[in-house]
Interface confidence: low
């Protein structure tokens, strides 16, 4: 529907994406050794939004590794069964529980590294991811609310004469869009899918024909994104009086001189009637001319000075209300 | 321990080109963001560029947009700075730095490498 | 972009005493998830910048607990309880809600 509707309009878009939060670990690679476990806070959440289709890294608690006996992530996805990855330090053992989906696994062997990574983001993986590690002094967790983002799909397009829909497609959240100029705007539509993603749209009309141009800013947790387009000038009551002046004159103008040869006419022929001395080149003449004065105003060869003025009065209208902002 | 090591920096003529390196050790360096930060002499910090661990997004500061390029090897854990028509105004100490989380701190520096553009 | 502004530029502080930065942001920096994108940075003579704060009020990892940090929205506040003399140096506030990063003019902390 907007490609077909965009091939109407004077379409020119442009997009400035403001990114948010750039990248994608929230690990702390050197393991800091802390002496006195009371410092480590006991339980840490986390919430954290994440791009899709990004790679996550979700770290553990910075305990340091001699004083562990167990590392465990709890994965829990919505509609799921718990998953829960298990690693034993005395034994060297790994331990999973219901976990099925491939793209989360650890980082490396969790000897090595006991971070959780996420290769890469699904929209699936909205959850809740927890570290839990159990020390001698007891257990230590974080937590992490994972919030998958997904990018929506801008799209401009002018429906009809002066109104703009603006579509933000399948976005996570919802985007929110704003106009700039503030138009006559219907309520904004919401429509959900299955995948948690939203699409909205809104839909507004410009009356006055000092607005030509209309930006449609969308705000979104994954960045912004400002389009715009510009409305085509529709034929309307004032901007036609002013395009179509040239033409009224200029049929005026003719009418005028039509009628004035006329009246000349018939006053020639009254002369002829009254003075029969008179020479036929001379009534040739007057008869022939209101035929030659229609031709010259009619014909499309002759009008070359009065189309060529019209059209520039045309363009410069025209050319004023497209860089009205 | 976490390092990250300039280098390439110079003396170099306005219009010309350079391209710095900063070499990562000491940690996952395909795991985390990475960014280049300058600083004038005797002025402020002014973000220059940031890359995406994967490498898939870039940004730039308006100042040097179009002019200078991010870019990585995870496989050499190396970030680098093309650096294109090179200004007097590009005259500063150039530190690449990690994004520690999403958004939230730059948590090391590298000690800083000088570019002097002059005639 | 959004402008950060620091005050004061410069602050002389005698050792022991306390000291505050105060940092306001054009725009707001709290983001949806309840954390405020500004971070706190330090940089002592001749060296590179350090990570002091994070996400507002957040000590980044060997930083003496001496440093706090405050604020939320657009004003917020980095406090030195007892100055000490390897604090001084130039504290910069930076915001990294969104592109570009942006620093203040940074506020230069001395022995007084």
């Known amino acids: 529907e907007g490609a077909a509707q965009s091939n109407n309009s004077l379409m020119l878009q442009t997009s400035k994406e403001n990114h948010t939060l750039a990248s994608n670990s929230l690990c702390m690679d050197e393991k800091q050794i802390t002496q006195n476990h009371s410092k480590v806070l006991a339980e840490v959440n986390i919430s954290w939004p994440v791009q899709m289709a990004r790679n996550a890294v979700l770290c553990c608690p910075p305990i340091e590794f001699r004083n562990l006996i167990v590392i465990t992530w709890e994965i829990i996805l919505r509609g799921q069964p718990s998953c829960t990855k298990t690693y034993r330090k005395d034994t060297n053992e790994t331990k999973e529980t219901n976990c099925t989906d491939e793209r989360i696994t650890w980082v490396s062997t969790p000897d090595q590294n006991s971070d959780l990574q996420i290769h890469p983001v699904a929209i699936t993986h909205d959850g809740y991811y927890r570290c839990i590690m159990a020390t001698p002094d007891g257990n230590f967790h974080r937590g992490y609310h994972l919030q998958v983002l997904v990018t929506p799909e801008v799209t401009l397009f002018e429906s009809r004469n002066r109104t703009a829909v603006c579509k933000a497609v399948a976005g996570k959240p919802a985007a929110q869009i704003s106009w700039i100029p503030a138009g006559d705007c219907a309520p904004t539509e919401q429509e959900y899918w299955g995948n948690g993603t939203v699409t909205v749209k809104s839909t507004c009309h410009w009356e006055g024909h000092n607005v030509s141009t209309v930006t449609c800013h969308v705000s979104h947790l994954t960045g912004n994104k400002s389009l715009y387009i510009e409305l085509l000038p529709v034929p309307g009551a004032k901007k036609s009086a002013k395009l179509y002046m040239p033409y009224v004159i200029l049929t005026i103008i003719i009418l005028t001189i039509v009628g004035f040869i006329w009246l000349l006419k018939i006053s020639g022929c009254r002369k002829y009637n009254l003075n029969k001395t008179e020479s036929t080149s001379v009534v040739e003449e007057d008869e022939m001319q209101p035929y030659a004065s229609y031709t010259e105003k009619n014909n499309p060869l002759y009008d070359t000075t009065n189309k060529v003025k019209a059209s520039q009065a045309l363009q410069s209208e025209v050319g004023t209300d497209l860089h009205t902002l | 321990q976490v390092q990250l090591v300039e280098s390439g920096g110079g003396v170099v003529q306005p219009g010309r080109s350079l391209r710095l390196s900063c070499v990562a050790s000491?940690?996952?360096?395909?795991?985390?963001?990475m960014h280049w930060v300058r600083q004038a002499p005797g002025k402020g910090l002014e973000w220059v560029a940031i890359?995406?661990?994967?490498?898939?997004?870039?940004y730039y500061a308006d100042s040097v947009k179009g002019r200078f390029t991010i870019s990585r090897d995870n496989s050499k854990n190396t970030l680098y700075l093309q650096m294109n028509s090179l200004r007097a105004e590009d005259t500063a100490v150039y530190y690449c730095a990690r994004d520690r989380i999403v958004g939230a701190g730059f948590d090391y520096w590298g000690q800083g490498t000088l570019v002097t553009v002059s005639s | 972009d959004i402008v950060m502004t620091q005050s004061p530029l410069s602050l002389p502080v005698t050792p022991g005493e306390p000291a505050s930065i105060s940092c306001r942001s054009s725009q707001s920096l709290l983001h949806s998830n309840g954390y405020n994108y500004l971070d706190w940075y330090l940089q002592k003579p001749g060296q590179s910048p350090q990570l002091l704060i994070y996400?507002?009020?957040n000590r980044a990892s060997g930083v003496p607990d001496r440093f706090s940090g405050s604020g939320s929205g657009t004003d917020f506040t980095l406090k030195i309880s007892r100055l000490e003399a390897e604090d001084v140096g130039v504290y910069y506030c930076?915001?990294?809600?969104?592109?570009?990063?942006?620093f203040g003019q940074g506020t230069k902390v001395e022995i007084k």
């Open positions: 996400l507002g009020s």
């Open positions: 890359i995406w661990n994967d490498g898939s997004n870039r």
């Open positions: 930076m915001q990294g809600l969104q592109t570009p990063w942006t």
């Open positions: 000491g940690f996952t360096f395909s795991s985390y963001g």
